[in-house]
């Protein structure tokens, strides 16, 4: 899977989208993880609701909901109040009995919000610093990764 | 029990190469990434590079392209780095160590790292 | 590279003290900054990864914070055990890179 860059700004809200295949996930209850470490495990943050017909209804678990459009083949996380700690690697998931088809890689990078001067020197301001090797980030916006681009170097 | 066992201390003379082993147990090395960290004497860490075993993708500090090649057998779990045209500053502690890549591990294993003397 | 800058680079504290340590980088690193702990003869020790978040079975008198280009490192009440070098390292970028290490010692 190729990474998707979604760039939010700090305090504000970032809705990251995660189309797929209607048909072939038909019936399948979706979910969104947080990847701990590139190899590591994902942990579940929140699940669209435990009844697939009401997968429409928006479910939060604290600032992240998710929501689906089961017809359009779209799943959609909002992340409220983003903050630096929300940075890293998610995955947007469909679930099958106890196994999970990963729909879609996401990184979320967080933003200075340009308004705040308060915390000025804590957040990265777009244009300020380039944070991949050979590659354009078009900010407040997302991306793809290109095939087997690296965005950051693997650490812990 | 996980742990990263290397080889033993080396001593060579300028201008040869050496080669530092690094088996890992209790896990598998494919699920990992392996890097390489050294230290001289009563100095700091120095990151040299990494390689994902998996992919048998590599990657290396500018500092140490060209003369470090780090490779990885799967089938032994066994990580290897390889420095050549060794000189008197390349004497160190080299260390493997193995995470779970970026955007926040929560698995950091270290081998307990080899020293390599350098002297003519 | 990125260059990471810590301070002190030593200090002398007593058991119960609270020591503080700092670590600049020379460009945003978001929270990608991970706190070491290295005792001499021994590999380094994984304390805090993400900036702030405490590894497993680290003591809780440990905490970071900080994001961006400035972070710190907390010893809330140091024990005997906490006499050590302390580095921080960057992984934003290529090469990863290490403070140079700040080294606590007994008072």
């Known amino acids: 899977h190729n990474t998707t860059v979604f760039q939010g700004v700090a305090g504000q809200s970032l809705q990251v989208s995660c189309p797929y295949d209607s048909m072939k996930h038909w019936g399948r209850r979706k979910a969104w993880c947080r990847q701990l470490g590139e190899k590591g495990p994902c942990q579940r943050v929140v699940s669209t609701h435990n009844l697939w017909l009401l997968s429409f209804l928006r479910r939060w678990n604290g600032s992240t909901a998710i929501t689906d459009d089961t017809l359009g083949g779209t799943l959609t996380i909002t992340l409220r109040n983003l903050q630096p700690h929300d940075a890293g690697l998610y995955q947007c998931q469909s679930l099958h009995g106890s196994e999970a088809d990963t729909l879609r890689k996401v990184l979320v990078e967080v933003l200075a919000d340009p308004l705040d001067h308060r915390d000025a020197g804590d957040l990265w301001f777009p244009g300020e610093s380039e944070s991949f090797e050979d590659a354009h980030v078009e900010h407040s916006i997302s991306r793809s990764l290109l095939e087997g681009e690296i965005p950051f170097p693997p650490t812990s | 029990q996980v742990q990263l066992v290397q080889s033993g201390a080396e001593v060579k003379k300028p201008g040869a190469s050496v080669k530092v082993s690094c088996k890992a147990s209790g896990f598998s090395i494919e699920d990992f990434y392996i890097h390489w960290v050294r230290q001289a004497p009563g100095q700091g860490l120095e990151w040299m590079g990494w390689i994902d075993p998996e992919q048998g993708d590599s990657k290396y500090a500018p500092k140490f392209q060209g003369r470090v090649t780090i490779t990885a057998d799967t089938s032994t779990s066994t990580a290897y780095m390889e420095l050549s045209s060794l000189r008197s500053e390349d004497t160190a502690v080299y260390y493997c160590?193995?995470?779970?890549?970026?955007?926040?591990?929560?698995?950091?294993?270290w081998g307990q790292g080899t020293l390599v003397t350098v002297s003519s | 590279d990125i260059q990471m800058t810590q301070s002190p680079s030593s200090l002398s504290a007593s058991v119960g003290d609270r020591v503080t340590i700092t670590c600049h980088a020379s460009?945003?690193?978001?929270?990608?900054l991970s706190w070491y702990q290295q005792k001499p003869g021994k590999a380094p020790k994984l304390l805090i990864y993400?900036?702030?978040n405490l590894h497993t079975g680290v003591p809780s008198r440990f905490s970071g914070s900080g994001s961006g280009t400035d972070f710190t490192l907390t010893i809330s009440s140091l024990q005997p055990e906490d006499f050590a070098t302390y580095y921080c390292q960057q992984g934003q970028t290529y090469p990863r890179t290490f403070g140079q290490g700040t080294k606590v010692e007994i008072k």
């Open positions: 993400k900036a702030s």
């Open positions: 160590h193995a995470d779970h890549g970026n955007y926040g591990s929560t698995m950091d294993y």
């Open positions: 460009q945003h690193i978001n929270v990608w």
